[in-house]
Structure formats: structure tokens, C-alpha cells
């Protein structure tokens, strides 16, 4: 099953090749999904961006670029416990029919060794669309910074909708958040990833609503078994 | 601002299939985040989802028509269609398409729509 | 499926009135109802979502309040325009989008 992806409201163009681990998930030419080069072979995403087949863009900030790298893949594995009913461990990794070329502008992301606490500043990027409800989708990558946002707080805005893998972002009285185009985008704090783009309130930007995140910290363990079993 | 037309057949022949057509003008299925549905209403009646659409494909059906049902979308027309196989007299109804706003965007968003804007309806009757 | 019931089945009011339509969801749905009004030969309106968010261009007279499985839809003084038939609809489950049986509201 389907779903359309997620983009960055209120936020601005990143600096040129400030983030050589993003990549966008393309289906044909159209964006689907944001996503992060783990390692030549792999890009990590979330699960509700899953297709049959994934077209890569690497390498550039700019979506069209001919000097990007596009890859195809047609092998992706889901969280076993991905749940399309309660969105719990949305996160998938995708394997690449071919090797991505690292170079200044292709690098991996830092997976990381511990989970950042509430109030850690970090940047969320990706392609996904700037105005909402109508979308605007941009041809560069944009990033907006935010702070990680307590369970607790997150969960008075959010209830019963919230799991415990998940994780808030946003700024108080802001608009700063991701939207349709971002998912499966990072959220990169102190230079390691710890968030995929997952959910949030719709229309986009909405003050005060949090963006929701895969917990990357807790599934680190799965990311590394994953690739190792399906090298 | 945004309007949504049904069109198809007004009478449909038993164990036939009924096919009608949405389309939206004032605004563009392919570059919205929003879903795109139907809903019947039988003679005197309540009203009853049938199934919805998203504009990259995704289909979300009533598990009471699931077998029966396809709905589809055409980005270059502008439309979004339903054909609803096999049908009987309990299939008469007032058909409506509509535009189903969502409350989340990704993960979330195929859960929580409801309809905030609606076609005026066109009724068909299923008799030999 | 969430079934939601919608009471009374029929309302006689008068213009001037505050009128109050009441449906209850087989089964929590937290916040996610919608109020639509339909007159006969018309398509439903949207008034209401998210249980108590007035739709744009909707008058203020008409507001939604609950949670759960109980919610009202008030009509703080009934307009001539206001005699329709009223809907609730459940879209907070996994399961269909499920409507009430409908509320008429009928001159007394």
C-alpha cells in the first residue's frame, strides 16, 4: 500500500552540500519520499514511503541536477513491526541495485550511539512542500531548525496517537515543521540522525503541533542486523 | 474555488457495472494533499462511504464493497472515477464525489478525512 | 465497524430556538467527528470537523462540543435556513468512515 509523502514549512534553502547524506525517493521523476544514505548499498527511510520500485537521487541539492546520481532500487524491507493503523516503527531501509559513489557531496549518515534529550536543537531537511494545504514543492533542499520536544509535552498535543519510539520536534508559537514530501527525511542533531520524518497535523505548520518522528536511536540495533542479513 | 461534477449513466442494468466520473475543476487533483472519495445515499435514506483516493493512486475501500468497488484517478483529466461491479436494486442511490481533508500529512493521513467539499450528486437507479 | 447513533430521529423547533442534536460512537473516536447539514435534493454541507472546529463561512450560531463517544451538535438560535437534516460522522478508526442515521430538524 502506498502513501504520499511529506515538505518543510517555514524553513530556507540549506547551505550547499551541507547534508551530502540526503537523498530523495523518487517515483519516476515525482518526489515521493526524502531519505538518508546509511551506507553504499543502503538508504534509510520511513515505512508508510514504501513502493515497488525507488528511483535515488544523490549527490545534489538540487532535485533535476544532472550531475546528481540516480540509482534505481527494488528491494526494500519494512520494520517488521511497522503498523499502518497506530504508525508505529515506520522505518525502512532500501537497498540499492548499484553502489553509490561517495564523494564531498555523497557522504553517510552518522547513526547514532545515544538519543539526544528534549530541548537539543536540530535540523530537518528535505524537498517536500513549503505551503500548505496547496502545495509549493521546491527544486533545492530546505531545512528549517527545531528543538526535540518532551513525550510528555508532545503527548498533550497529540494523546492516545503517540508510541514511544516516536519523537517531537517543533518550536513553541512557530511554524517550523516538516510536511507532505519530507517523510523518511532526516532530523539530524549534533551530527547524528536521530529522527526520519513520519507525521504531523494537516494543513502543515500549524503553531504549537510538533512534527512526529521515528526514533532512530532505538532501532539502531535493526538497521545494522537488517543490512548485514540482506547483504 | 474549488467544484466538483459527477457524470455516468443515470440507469444501470442488473449484474451490470456502473461506472461514474468526478471532475474537479478550480483546483488541480495532482498537486494537493487532499483525498478524493465518494459517498451514496439511498432513496430516503443515510448516507455511506463507498471508498476514497489519494492523487499518487492509494485506494482506501469500504470493507462492505470492497469486492465490488475500483476507484481510480486521472491526473491529466482532472478526474477521479468509480466503477462499481455487479450491481442491484440496493445499489440505487444518489452518488456523490468529494474532497476528503486530511487532519495529518504522512504516516498518518489515510486515518483521519472527512469531506469538506462536495459534487451536487447524480442519481442512479439500477432496473431492467 | 464504529456504528454512530444519532438522537433524536426527528426535531420540531421553532425559529429563535437553541436546538441541540446528540451522537454517540459505538466506540471511542477521540475528536475526530464531522457535522454536515443536507437539505432535500442537495448535497451535505460540511459545519463541523474535529468535533468542535467551525468550518469556514459557517455562522457562528452552529457549534460541536465533545469527546470520546459523546458529542452534540448546538444550533444557539434556529434560522429559517437552519430546517435540514443533520449528519454525524465517525472518521477517527481504521475501520470505515461511518455516518449517523441522520437528525431532521422540522418547523413545530
Known amino acids: 500500500e502506498e502513501a504520499q509523502g511529506d515538505k518543510i514549512i517555514d524553513g530556507a534553502p540549506c547551505a550547499r552540500g551541507s547534508h551530502p547524506w540526503q537523498v530523495a525517493l523518487l517515483s519516476g521523476n515525482q518526489l515521493h519520499c526524502g531519505g538518508v544514505l546509511v551506507n553504499e548499498r543502503w538508504v534509510l527511510t520511513a515505512a508508510h514511503c514504501k513502493m515497488n520500485e525507488y528511483t535515488v537521487h544523490l549527490g545534489s541539492d538540487t532535485l533535476g541536477d544532472r550531475r546528481a546520481q540516480r540509482i534505481k532500487a527494488s528491494k526494500s524491507f519494512r520494520h517488521p513491526g511497522y503498523s499502518t493503523q497506530t504508525h508505529v516503527n515506520d522505518l525502512m531501509l532500501v537497498k540499492l541495485n548499484s553502489q553509490a559513489r561517495l564523494s564531498s557531496m555523497v557522504k553517510k549518515v552518522r547513526l547514532p550511539s545515544r538519543c539526544e534529550p528534549p530541548g537539543t536543537t536540530c535540523t530537518v531537511s528535505g524537498w517536500g512542500t513549503t505551503t500548505s494545504p496547496d502545495v509549493t514543492f521546491p527544486s533545492d533542499l530546505m531545512c528549517v531548525d527545531v528543538k526535540l520536544i518532551s513525550p510528555q509535552d508532545c503527548t498533550k498535543v497529540y494523546k492516545d496517537l503517540l508510541e514511544n519510539s516516536m519523537l517531537c520536534a517543533g518550536i513553541p508559537d512557530s511554524k517550523k515543521n516538516a510536511c507532505n514530501g519530507d517523510s523518511g527525511g532526516p532530523l539530524v542533531c549534533r551530527g547524528t540522525l536521530q529522527g526520519l520524518v513520519s507525521w504531523g497535523t494537516f494543513p502543515c505548520g500549524q503553531p504549537n503541533d510538533p512534527g512526529v518522528y521515528t526514533q532512530v536511536c532505538k532501532f539502531t540495533k535493526w538497521i545494522n542486523d537488517t543490512m548485514k542479513k540482506h547483504r | 474555488q474549488l467544484q466538483l461534477q459527477e457524470s455516468g449513466p443515470g440507469l444501470v442494468k442488473p449484474s451490470e457495472t456502473l461506472s461514474l466520473t468526478c471532475t474537479v475543476s478550480g483546483g488541480s487533483i495532482s498537486s494537493s494533499s487532499y483525498y478524493w472519495g465518494w459517498i451514496r445515499q439511498p432513496p430516503g435514506k443515510g448516507l455511506e462511504w463507498i471508498g476514497s483516493i489519494s492523487y499518487s493512486g492509494s485506494t482506501y475501500y469500504n470493507p462492505s464493497l470492497k469486492s465490488r468497488v475500483t476507484i481510480s484517478v486521472d491526473t491529466s483529466k482532472n478526474q477521479f472515477s468509480l466503477k462499481l461491479s455487479s450491481v442491484t436494486a440496493a445499489d440505487t442511490a444518489v452518488y456523490y464525489c468529494?474532497?476528503?481533508?486530511?487532519?495529518?500529512?504522512?504516516?498518518?493521513?489515510?486515518?483521519?478525512?472527512?469531506?469538506?467539499?462536495w459534487g451536487k450528486g447524480t442519481t442512479v437507479t439500477v432496473s431492467s | 465497524d464504529i456504528q454512530m447513533t444519532q438522537s433524536p430521529s426527528t426535531l420540531s423547533a421553532s425559529v429563535g430556538d437553541r436546538v441541540t442534536i446528540t451522537c454517540r460512537a459505538s466506540q471511542s473516536i477521540s475528536s475526530w467527528l464531522a457535522w454536515y447539514q443536507q437539505k432535500p435534493g442537495k448535497a451535505p454541507k460540511l459545519l463541523i470537523y474535529?468535533?468542535?472546529s467551525l468550518e469556514s463561512g459557517v455562522p457562528s450560531r452552529f457549534s460541536g462540543s465533545g469527546s470520546g463517544t459523546e458529542f452534540t451538535l448546538t444550533i444557539s438560535s434556529l434560522q429559517p435556513d437552519d430546517f435540514a437534516t443533520y449528519y454525524c460522522e465517525q472518521y477517527g478508526s481504521y475501520s470505515p468512515l461511518t455516518f449517523g442515521g441522520g437528525t431532521k430538524v422540522e418547523i413545530k
Open positions: 468529494a474532497r476528503g481533508a486530511p487532519t495529518y500529512f504522512g504516516a498518518a493521513s489515510h486515518y483521519y478525512y472527512y469531506m469538506d467539499v
Open positions: 474535529k468535533a468542535s
